[in-house]
């Protein structure tokens, strides 16, 4: 899938964690088929 960023947004993060995607893990592998 593709995500495009850079569109204007007024949302704010409610946590102190970065909003970037975490490091990939094999658990995130898409199901075959």
């Amino acid at each position: 899938s593709e995500t495009t960023t850079g569109t204007s947004s007024n949302s704010s993060q409610s946590t102190s964690n970065s909003g970037l995607a975490p490091n990939p893990t094999n658990a995130t592998t898409k199901a075959a088929g």
């Epitope: 899938s1 995500t3 960023t5 993060q13 970065s18 909003g19 995607a21 990939p24 893990t25 592998t29």
Partner: antibody, heavy 118, light 107 residues
């Protein structure tokens, strides 16, 4: 030792396309997103986007969505960026960089110089 | 997008001196600012991440501070190899954005 080895300089004509490669070594290729960054005198550093090497999910900067295509070849631990419909404004140095969630862009390639000229 | 304003764009100093570079974000980025060093014929080097955490192998004369919108990079006791370009970059949200850079030159 983590290394990102990029392909060599490119001189292409306006309207053409180019594919830049970034071969990773010294770490588990699928464990980190691969990012791409453009450096030009006019705009300094601009983030193009990133790709998840496991799922091939991509996140793009809106500005580069129609310009860049990101792919990976897990068998060779290589990431690729294809740039199309090139103009003089695409002339720049392009970097691949590994992104770690905690540390951000912790390792960079040496850069690939792209010159678009007729 | 988060705009990053970096200053100064140019700085001249001598070995042994202490210098400070500033970056301001257009909105709060929590602690998520990184600093990089760029030198000719070398790959870009991550110095500091998450505002103040020193990357492994980076000398302790490099120090980052700040949170929210205002951040600083301080280099104490400048060494000859420290004269280079420095960039800040927010890693709080997409798209990642960079400051315009600071060129640190020998006075």
């Amino acid at each position: 030792e983590v290394q990102l080895q990029q392909s060599g300089p490119e001189l292409v004509k306006p309207g053409a396309s180019v594919k830049i490669s970034c071969k990773a070594s010294g770490y588990e290729f699928t464990g980190y997103h691969m990012n791409w960054v453009k450096q030009s005198p006019e705009k300094s550093l601009e983030w193009i986007g990133e790709i998840n090497p496991i799922t091939s999910d991509k996140t793009f900067n809106q500005k580069f969505k129609a310009k860049a295509t990101l792919t990976v070849d897990r068998s060779s631990s290589t990431a690729y960026m294809h740039l199309k419909s090139l103009t003089s404004e695409d002339s720049a140095v392009y970097y691949c960089a590994r992104r770690d969630y905690d540390t951000s862009l912790d390792y960079w390639g040496q850069g690939t110089t792209l010159t678009v000229s007729s | 997008d988060v705009q990053i304003t970096q200053s100064p764009s140019y700085l001249a100093a001598s070995p042994g001196e202490t210098i400070t570079i500033y970056c301001r974000a257009s909105k709060s980025i929590s602690k998520y600012l990184a600093w990089y060093q760029e030198k000719p014929e070398k790959t870009n080097r991550l110095l500091i991440y998450a505002g103040s955490t020193l990357q492994s192998g980076i000398p302790s004369r490099f120090r980052g501070s700040g949170s929210g919108k205002d951040f600083t990079l301080t280099v104490s006791g400048l060494e000859p190899e420290d004269f280079a370009m420095y960039y800040c970059q927010q890693h709080n949200e997409y798209p990642l954005t960079f400051g315009a850079g600071t060129k640190l030159e020998l006075k």
